[in-house]
């Protein structure tokens, strides 16, 4: 979380960002709040990228003027134009591209005052891992995959009744390039897995974590899984 | 100022389908919701749901699930709403519009449906 | 669903009167409401967008109040161009909601 000032004359305003993560090919969105101002036409939001020159987005007298906009930001980015007015200047990020990592500058001027606030965005990708019995290996096995991952993480196994132990020797993990030759896939094999217990898979780079946690009884199957975000807000 | 331009009349027969445009100048399409709004003659104004341009998601009324399908066309600042199985129930003026901001309508459509 | 209750559903009023709309949400929707103008066989003209902001080229005389459940529309001074119906909507929580209208007569 970051909170700015700006001072103009003897007017500033708060604005507010929080560090966030974008996932590599889908949509993002940059976090930054204001101090509302209920004028729109008197509003005017920048956001700017360390070492890019021009801008990434600009929205004021209530729309877009990208004409000094970035050409690797061209097409990709819209403010929640609706909400401006209650003080919401997030960015929202179409795509987006490992190369979108950096330092951001949400800039804010209103009839109140001028204020900016930095904001660290991670890029990278993380994924929801999924725990399935492995019918086909010689032994009981659970196999946890993860379509997505960058950069590479750390796989571990854990369960509710050997808390604890350490599971390396009994565990392999592999990691496989996926098709845009970036990302990877994640598959951990847990062998000599035993009935009426708890099994947790857990991923994590940088920037997430994520486990999934499967329950294997002689009736049923449970499972559940989280992702959680590194270092955010 | 915002310009929401909407497409023409239509006259429908019963069961048909129609799909009706909205095309918006002076403004970056992507960062408003587009709204659409329906008016029965002589009755109140009845959100049908909104299309965000930036995503192509999606919010409906319940009421008109399955009846309009909300999409865009980014490359033409275009919004559009298709109705299917047409019925009388669905005559009515539709409005594109903002809703909160920069607050415009579309000067309407008026889709009448009559065998 | 929220209920936006709008009052009075018409009215008639002099020139140069003070004229208040009301309406009434069924839950609290902070200030996420605007209010609407149409003339018959318009569209409708946006007058106040969240509850308080008067839009772009509104003349001075409406003005919007409330936040929460209750809200108001008031013409500090009835013209004749004021003749109408209006209409609030509430855009806090899906799915958005119309008041039924007050359709506005000068006497």
């Known amino acids: 979380l970051i909170i700015g000032f700006g001072i103009s004359g003897k007017h500033f305003i708060t604005v507010t960002t929080f560090t966030s993560a974008g996932n590599i090919g889908e949509d993002g969105t940059l976090s930054c709040t204001f101090e509302p101002d209920i004028k729109l036409n008197g509003i005017v939001i920048q956001w700017l990228k360390e070492g890019i020159k021009g801008l990434v987005h600009e929205f004021k007298e209530g729309k877009d003027d990208l004409s000094q906009q970035h050409e690797m930001f061209r097409g990709r980015t819209a403010v929640f134009a609706d909400q401006v007015v209650v003080g919401n200047a997030s960015l929202r990020l179409k795509n987006v591209q490992l190369t979108d990592a950096g330092t951001y500058t949400c800039y804010i001027r209103t009839s109140k005052g001028k204020g900016n606030a930095n904001l660290e965005y991670k890029t990278g990708a993380f994924s929801m891992p999924e725990i399935n019995v492995d019918y086909n290996a010689s032994s009981e096995s659970l196999r946890c995959e993860a379509p997505r991952w960058f950069p590479q993480p750390t796989v571990a196994w854990a369960s509710q009744v050997d808390q604890g132990a350490n599971f390396s020797e009994v565990s392999n993990t592999s990691f496989e390039l996926n098709s845009e030759n970036v990302t990877m896939k994640v598959v951990s094999v847990l062998y000599n897995v035993t009935i009426n217990n708890t099994y947790s898979c857990m991923i994590e780079n940088d920037i997430a974590k994520a486990t999934g946690d499967i329950k294997v009884t002689d009736s049923e199957v449970k499972r559940r899984s989280q992702l959680q975000l590194l270092n955010s807000g | 100022q915002v310009q929401l331009q909407q497409s023409g009349a239509e006259l429908m027969k019963p069961g048909a389908s129609v799909k009706i445009s909205c095309k918006a100048s002076?403004?970056?399409?992507?960062?408003?919701?587009m709204h659409w709004v329906k008016q029965s003659h002589g009755k109140s104004l009845e959100w049908v749901g909104y299309?965000?341009?930036?995503?192509?998601?999606?919010s409906y009324n319940q009421k008109f699930k399955g009846k309009a399908t909300l999409t865009v066309d980014k490359s033409s600042s275009t919004a559009y709403m298709h109705l299917s199985s047409l019925t009388s129930e669905d005559s009515g003026v539709y409005y594109c519009?903002?809703?909160?901001?920069?607050?415009?309508w579309g000067q309407g459509t008026l889709v009448t449906v009559s065998a | 669903d929220i209920v936006m209750t709008q009052s009075p559903s018409s009215m008639y009023a002099s020139l140069g009167e003070r004229v208040t709309i009301t309406c009434k949400a069924s839950q609290d929707i902070k200030s996420y409401l605007s209010w609407y103008q149409q003339k018959p066989w318009k569209s409708p003209k946006t007058l106040i967008y969240?509850?308080?902001s008067l839009a772009d080229g509104v003349p001075s005389r409406f003005s919007g109040s409330g936040s929460g459940q209750d809200f108001s529309l008031t013409i500090s001074s009835l013209e004749s161009d004021d003749t109408a119906t209006y209409y609030c909507l509430q855009h806090g929580e899906s799915p958005y909601t119309f008041g039924g209208g007050t359709k506005l007569e000068i006497k």
């Open positions: 299309v965000d341009p930036f995503n192509g998601g999606t």
């Open positions: 002076d403004y970056s399409f992507t960062s408003y919701y």
């Open positions: 519009a903002f809703i909160a901001g920069f607050a415009n």
């Open positions: 969240y509850a308080t």
